[in-house]
């Protein structure tokens, strides 16, 4: 580390005076201190000489001696005050920039430490501090106020108590930058636009920022719109607007409207389309089939896009049957507003009944007129069978009557044995009815098939059983010829709350 | 909801001294200035000091300087004002006020205690 | 220390009709854009509310017919429509520098 003589931290001398500073070091040797005149350098090898021989008060500040070789970087420094009676101060710089929330020194060095006691800083024109100004005092320094804000960006001065009077420094002006974290923040509204030609509209494009230094500008299809601009300061944020107004609207109005706005930190920007159409319109739409089959007891949502401009003024979900006048409670539809001009409508229909298959009709209204989308609902139900035995054309016949949606497929079985079902390794054969006869088919209802099964003699110890199944489940019947009536064994189970 | 709440109403012989407190709940305590206020029905609201919560750091009205001594306690949220050798003319209304510690510069007092009456009678 | 000068003194206003009420300061209250006034209510036997904040801000909760303007030395409070509620006294107070001031106050009173 290299050494100051004299070996003092402070040396207090008055104007005129003349000053050596002699550092040593094991290597050559530099030294740093305040920009000021008559001071003359002299080297040699592995010291240095710093001397004056007429002392001022801008001689005042500290010198440090530094060896450049040195890795560890080691310095020493010596604080001079050349006290001036008429001169206190010694103002190093005359502006001082930081960022906010920084702490920004005020470099005015005391030139006599005796008058630190009665020392303070005020903004000029003898204006008090600002409130909570933060700020502290060292002699060898100057002011430092803590955490600097934008608005003490100020004009400010240094005082010292000398002889019971106050004497200031020059000026030295603060400025305090805010911290920009990034482009200007952007809103365009509306985010979408649709006129009738002839209408009026307006788009809105504006950006905000903690300091006033940006620009924006409104562009339509990439050509920039001349729009006078208003300016705010608000909450803390400067913000300007651009209000493009359109008394009638026609269709050279209508593309793509940039919002843009740009400041040091770089670029945003915000876009929106604004259309122009002939006349109202209204368009319903579904990302569902509008044909849906649901299982008895399940639920179902009816979904419904709607594009329509103007707004609509009214809308409905109606049930057209074929089971009952029975219409949708109110509390099962919702809407929802996906923008402006785009709405969803959902009827909620949970755990269905039989008597609520049928057509369900959206039906929406506009000043462009009424429209309509209409879901068809079937309900998918799991096959109940029924076998009788009967003579056709004076043979025996066993007769299977299957109702179900979507149509049951039958198949025949006879096993040994009397048994509620034929398990496989009972079976003594198997039929399959391909084209079982339809009986009934009507929309929305189930679909009834028969099956015959001529059989020459019943077996007596043998059972005969009736299958049926389609896409929900599967159902059968069992007839025992011995007794005194066949033996059902119902549908699969199946349950559902009414 | 933000409360401050103030001690209740003081009768005080002249040259007495009277402490009154101010308990804040539902805020940060730290993160705003306490601020005192004087209303007398003839000289309107007068701003007596401040004290930061964090570091007990004080500013005083040069009026109030020797009258009035501000204090915190951070562990019970509440600060209080001393105020001294008493006089018909403090006979007043005292309110706490909070003062937001912020990037904002404003310093507006957001929120006041209820007030605490002060008498000063022989 | 800055003075702050309210008038009217008092005032009355008719039920739904603006009144205004002015402040100004001995000293500018304004630094880069930023105007260090605000607007307190006080009804009696209640404590001050802040209503305005920053001369033209609206504090949280406080209904839009109230608002505020100006800058440097001179400033004002709108209230319109006025409401039956609105009977209170209406102070300003500085906060640029110590200490914070307040104006003597006006007492506003609904016809």
């Known amino acids: 580390i290299p050494v100051i003589e004299p070996s003092v931290p402070e040396l207090v001398v008055k104007p005129g005076a003349t000053v050596t500073l002699r550092c040593v070091g094991n290597g050559s040797v530099e030294w740093d201190g305040p920009p000021s005149p008559h001071w003359t350098l002299y080297s040699d090898g592995s010291s240095s000489i710093l001397s004056t021989n007429n002392a001022t008060f801008q001689n005042t500040g500290t010198y440090r001696c530094t060896e450049p070789g040195d890795p560890l970087g080691g310095s020493a420094a010596i604080h001079l005050y050349v006290k001036d009676p008429a001169r206190p101060w010694n103002v190093l710089a005359q502006e001082v920039v930081v960022f906010e929330d920084q702490d920004a020194l005020l470099p005015c060095l005391l030139t006599d430490p005796v008058l630190e006691a009665g020392v303070s800083l005020v903004r000029v024109r003898g204006r008090p501090l600002m409130r909570h100004t933060n700020y502290s005092f060292s002699p060898w320094h100057g002011f430092t106020i803590h955490r600097a804000k934008f608005i003490q960006s100020q004009d400010y001065q240094c005082s010292a108590l000398m002889g019971g009077r106050k004497v200031m420094s020059i000026s030295i002006r603060l400025k305090v930058q805010k911290v920009i974290p990034g482009p200007p923040a952007l809103t365009l509204v509306p985010a979408e636009l649709v006129r009738i030609r002839g209408e009026a509209a307006q788009i809105v494009c504006s950006a905000s920022s903690v300091d006033v230094n940006f620009d924006v500008f409104l562009q339509h299809n990439n050509t920039k719109l001349a729009i006078p601009q208003q300016s705010d300061f608000h909450n803390n944020r400067y913000q300007k607007v651009l209000t493009l107004n359109l008394d009638q609207v026609d269709f050279q109005h209508a593309g793509n409207y940039s919002c843009v706005a740009s400041n040091v930190q770089g670029k945003h920007s915000t876009s929106m389309f604004f259309r122009v159409v002939e006349s109202a319109y209204l368009n319903l739409s579904s990302e569902q089939n509008l044909i849906q089959e649901v299982t008895v007891g399940e639920g179902l949502n009816l979904k419904v896009m709607v594009e329509a401009y103007p707004g609509l003024q009214g809308f409905n979900w109606t049930y057209l049957g074929p089971f009952s006048d029975h219409q949708p409670e109110p509390k099962l539809a919702n809407a929802t507003t996906k923008d402006t001009y785009r709405h969803t409508f959902t009827l909620s229909l949970p755990r269905l009944k039989p008597s609520e298959a049928g057509r369900y009709s959206f039906l929406a209204r506009n000043p462009g007129g009424w429209r309509a989308l209409t879901f068809e609902l079937t309900l998918r139900y799991p096959p109940e069978v029924s076998v009788i035995w009967t003579f056709i054309n004076g043979s025996g016949t066993l007769l299977c009557a299957a109702s179900g949606y979507p149509q049951p497929n039958v198949t025949w079985l006879q096993c040994s044995g009397h048994t509620d079902r034929c398990d496989e390794a009972q079976v003594l054969q198997v039929w399959d009815d391909p084209y079982p006869e339809v009986l009934s088919q009507e929309p929305f209802h189930k679909v009834t098939v028969q099956s015959l099964l001529t059989v020459e003699t019943l077996e007596h110890n043998q059972t005969y059983e009736c299958r049926a199944h389609n896409s929900v489940g599967s159902g059968s019947w069992a007839f025992i010829p011995i007794s005194a009536g066949a033996h059902t064994h119902p549908p699969d189970e199946f349950l559902f709350t009414p | 909801e933000v409360q401050l709440q103030q001690s209740g109403p003081e009768l005080v012989k002249p040259g007495a001294s009277v402490k009154i407190s101010c308990k804040a709940s539902a805020i940060t305590f730290t993160d705003y200035y306490m601020n005192w206020v004087k209303q007398s029905p003839g000289k309107g609201l007068e701003w007596i000091g401040d004290?930061?919560?964090?570091?007990?750091?004080?500013t005083y009205n040069q009026k109030f300087k020797g009258k009035a001594t501000l204090t915190v306690d951070k562990s019970s949220t509440t600060a209080y004002m001393e105020l001294r050798s008493l006089t018909s003319e403090d006979s007043a209304v005292y309110y706490c006020a909070r003062e937001k510690i912020s990037m904002e510069y404003y310093y507006a007092m957001d929120y006041w205690g209820q007030g605490t009456s002060v008498t000063v009678s022989s | 220390d800055i003075v702050l000068t309210q008038s009217p003194a008092s005032l009355a206003v008719s039920l739904g009709q603006r009144a205004t009420i002015s402040c100004r300061a001995s000293?500018?209250?304004?630094?880069?854009?930023?105007?260090?006034m605000h607007w307190y209510q006080q009804k009696p036997g209640q404590s001050p509310k802040l209503l305005i904040y920053?001369?033209?801000n609206l504090e949280s909760g406080v209904p839009a017919r109230f608002s505020g303007s100006g800058s440097a030395t001179d400033f004002t409070l709108n209230i319109h429509p006025v409401e039956e509620e609105d009977a209170a006294t209406y102070f300003c107070?500085?906060?640029?520098?110590?200490?914070?001031?307040f104006g003597g106050g006006t007492k506003l009173e609904i016809k």
């Open positions: 004290i930061n919560p964090n570091n007990g750091g004080t």
């Open positions: 107070q500085q906060s640029i520098e110590d200490p914070p001031t």
């Open positions: 920053a001369a033209s």
């Open positions: 000293e500018s209250v304004s630094s880069h854009d930023i105007h260090l």
